[in-house]
């Protein structure tokens, strides 16, 4: 495929990545799927600076990111190593809380109103952020 060299319309470029900020809500899996259909992934936060960038754009609103522990350990959707990477959990989080009465625990991570992270029920309809890296090969076939 061809390399993407600039961001699609309505996406925001920052540090060689493109970001799209939703204004509606979806369950985590639907948000994840939405990003994949855009040849992107739910946002993966790898630094203090990227955290600040995303925080600035989403404001004080619960927003899904590309981090989950639905299969056991916490994993970033793009394969970024969780254990050695940037983290910004709220105190006492993640707690895999079962007391919400919706069945199961809490397996998906989101930005809270102050930007710090919380784990929550993946079915909650939160906003989300998609990210795609510039210079990565796009899935579209090259123009002949």
């Amino acid at each position: 495929g061809s390399e993407r060299t600039c961001c699609p319309v309505n996406w925001v470029e920052h540090e060689r990545s493109c970001y799209w900020f939703s204004r509606s809500g979806k369950a985590w899996a639907d948000a994840d799927n939405y990003c994949r259909l855009e040849d992107a992934h739910l946002v993966v936060v790898t630094s203090w600076e990227e955290q600040k960038f995303v925080q600035h754009h989403i404001g004080p609103v619960n927003t899904w990111m590309g981090l989950h522990d639905q299969n056991g350990p916490w994993k970033w959707v793009d394969g970024t190593d969780y254990e050695t990477g940037f983290k910004n959990w709220r105190p006492e989080q993640p707690d895999d809380w079962y007391g919400h009465g919706l069945g199961g625990g809490e397996d998906c991570a989101h930005f809270t109103d102050d930007g710090r992270w919380n784990d929550d029920v993946c079915q909650r309809p939160y906003r989300w952020v998609c990210e795609t890296e510039l210079d990565k090969a796009s899935q579209e076939p090259p123009l002949l």
Partner: antibody, heavy 118, light 107 residues
Framework: QVQLVESGGGVVQPGRSLRLSCAAS????????MHWVRQAPGKGLEWVAV????????YYADSVKGRFTISRDNSKNTLSLQMNSLRAEDTAVYYC???????????WGQGTLVTVSS | DIQMTQSPSSLSASVGDRVTITCRAS??????LNWYQQKSGRAPKLLIY???SLQSGVPSRFSGSGSGTEFTLTINSLQPEDFAIYHC?????????FGQGTKVEIK
């Protein structure tokens, strides 16, 4: 009320080590990130290091990376800074500061003076 | 690293004056700019955070504005207790960096 009290400063020879401590009270220490910031005599402020509330992240200024180590003991409400291979340019008043929302220093200690001199 | 440049480095003013201090960042820091006041021999005190939010307990004569790379701290009607050094500080990215300070002296 929030209180931060630094200790451990003093005169030390170049190349030697020193350990600073910051005793916190008046707030839930384990819920806040903490920083060290220093100020050389007659100079401006210089950020030194930060540690997350749960120790998941630690960051350092390039000038101290590999020589200084920030740590905390949430059970004792204590922040520490282990300073090795000290240099004359590390001479400063060292402040501990509480982090309110990723890099906002909302409370500071009174500072402890470190003098590196032969 | 992001360089923070304050101007002026010092100024003389009288009680009742309106004082403005400028801080410029070497790159876009959005609104992640904080202001601190430091009196002689004392620890700094937070005045303004995220460019324009007044810290609890700080008098309303202090205000902040700006975004991106240019920021200002304004003191309306300077009071005797306001004579001090003022520092700007970016919290957009590590390493966190400060301006060199602005000393506000009595004229």
């Amino acid at each position: 009320q929030v209180q931060l009290v630094e200790s451990g400063g003093g005169v030390v020879q170049p190349g030697r080590s020193l350990r600073l401590s910051c005793a916190a009270s008046g707030f839930t220490f384990s819920s806040y990130g903490m920083h060290w910031v220093r100020q050389a005599p007659g100079k401006g402020l210089e950020w030194v290091a930060v540690i997350w509330h749960d120790e998941t992240n630690k960051y350092y200024a390039d000038s101290v990376k590999g020589r200084f180590t920030i740590s905390r003991d949430n059970s004792k409400n204590t922040l520490s800074l282990q300073m090795n291979s000290l240099r004359a340019e590390d001479t400063a008043v060292y402040y501990c500061a509480r982090d309110e929302r990723l890099g906002i220093f909302d409370y500071w200690g009174q500072g402890t003076l470190v003098t590196v001199s032969s | 690293d992001i360089q923070m440049t304050q101007s002026p480095s010092s100024l003389s003013a009288s009680v009742g004056d309106r004082v403005t201090i400028t801080c410029r960042a070497s790159q876009n820091i959005r609104n992640y700019l904080n202001w601190y006041q430091q009196k002689s021999g004392r620890a700094p005190k937070l005045l303004i955070y995220v460019a324009s939010s007044l810290q609890s307990g700080v008098p309303s004569r202090f205000s902040g504005s700006g975004s991106g790379t240019e920021f200002t701290l304004t003191i309306n009607s300077l009071q005797p207790e306001d004579f001090a050094i003022y520092h700007c500080h970016q919290s957009n990215s590590t390493p966190l960096t400060f301006g060199q300070g602005t000393k506000v002296e009595i004229k």
